[in-house]
């Protein structure tokens, strides 16, 4: 009888240890989940609000075809402008066509008038070639009109209807670009 009770007690203790272990694992899993959830919720909120509003672009961004554009309200140097765009999940504007250039310059005229706006174009110091930030070459009609006389790095900017060049360390507004969300409907 005593042996039977002792065996039951041992089994209960073993069960208890297993449950404690499971609880520990669950607590650890819950902590890990909470961290994942924090970022997952942020992503889902973005996705849901976009889906709910059926809006392909975030608030304060302008849409044209497959792209969304953000026109900054602050000045910064070219490299900081790029960083500011990355924070928003975008890159500096990359103008692919005359049509896109016309849309941008037309929009700028409506929004702000004739200011300077950094775009994602820079001149290679060695070869002197102009390249977009993704490494592609601009089409012949979209090369900066003037060569900057700067010994420093040279970057491209838009002003009025023109693409111009300047020392990358000068302060200008900037334009970010990201892909518009595709409607699944």
């Amino acid at each position: 009888k005593l042996l039977q009770v002792s065996t039951i007690a041992m089994q209960q203790q073993e069960k208890l240890i297993q449950q404690e272990r499971a609880l520990l694992n669950f607590t650890e899993w819950k902590r890990s989940c909470a961290l994942q959830m924090k970022y997952c919720q942020a992503f889902m909120q973005n996705s849901l609000s976009s889906a709910h509003n059926s809006s392909p672009c975030p608030n304060n961004w302008i849409q044209n075809r497959e792209s969304c554009y953000y026109v900054s309200e602050i000045w910064s140097i070219w490299h900081t402008s790029q960083e500011n765009c990355l924070k928003e999940g975008s890159t500096l504007l990359q103008i692919e066509s005359k049509e896109e250039m016309d849309f941008i310059t037309g929009s700028l005229r409506k929004i702000k008038g004739s200011y300077d706006y950094w775009v994602g174009l820079s001149q290679d110091g060695h070869s002197g070639r102009w390249l977009w930030q993704d490494g592609s070459s601009p089409s012949p009609g979209l090369l900066p009109a003037e060569r900057s006389q700067s010994a420093n790095q040279v970057c491209g900017y838009v002003k009025s209807n023109s693409l111009l060049s300047s020392n990358c360390s000068t302060w200008k507004y900037f334009i970010c670009e990201k892909y518009a969300l595709r409607s699944s409907v």
């Epitope: 961290l35 994942q36 970022y39 997952c40 942020a42 992503f43 990355l86 924070k87 928003e88 999940g89 975008s90 890159t91 930030q133 993704d134 490494g135 670009e177 990201k178 892909y179």
Partner: nanobody, 115 residues
Framework: QVQLVESGGGLVQPGGSLRLSCAAS????????MGWYRQAPGKERELVAA???????AYADSVKGRFTISRDNSKNTVYLQMDSLKPEDTDVYYC?????????WGKGTQVTVSS
Amino acid sequence: QVQLVESGGGLVQPGGSLRLSCAASVSIFSINAMGWYRQAPGKERELVAAITSGGRTAYADSVKGRFTISRDNSKNTVYLQMDSLKPEDTDVYYCKAYIRGEDYWGKGTQVTVSS
């Protein structure tokens, strides 16, 4: 706390290749953009390459045509394929993530290009 772990650095001869990896502890769907930066002693960190959640890319002039950034969403990892390496590419390479207005950095991986 988001953790970024870089790997793949090492010693390579000029003209050689390396592939750096940056693994994130959270889903990279929640990350606006990820970038690779490098820093030589006594100098500021500079952007080498970046990729946004939508897949747009940006490169420093000095690496265009030689380096390629890519991402694997299923592995929560961003890669930097470095080809035609030059001695001036020698640096500590850091991974950076932009999440909802906050920046997170990895601890870095050393890349040395030398014969």
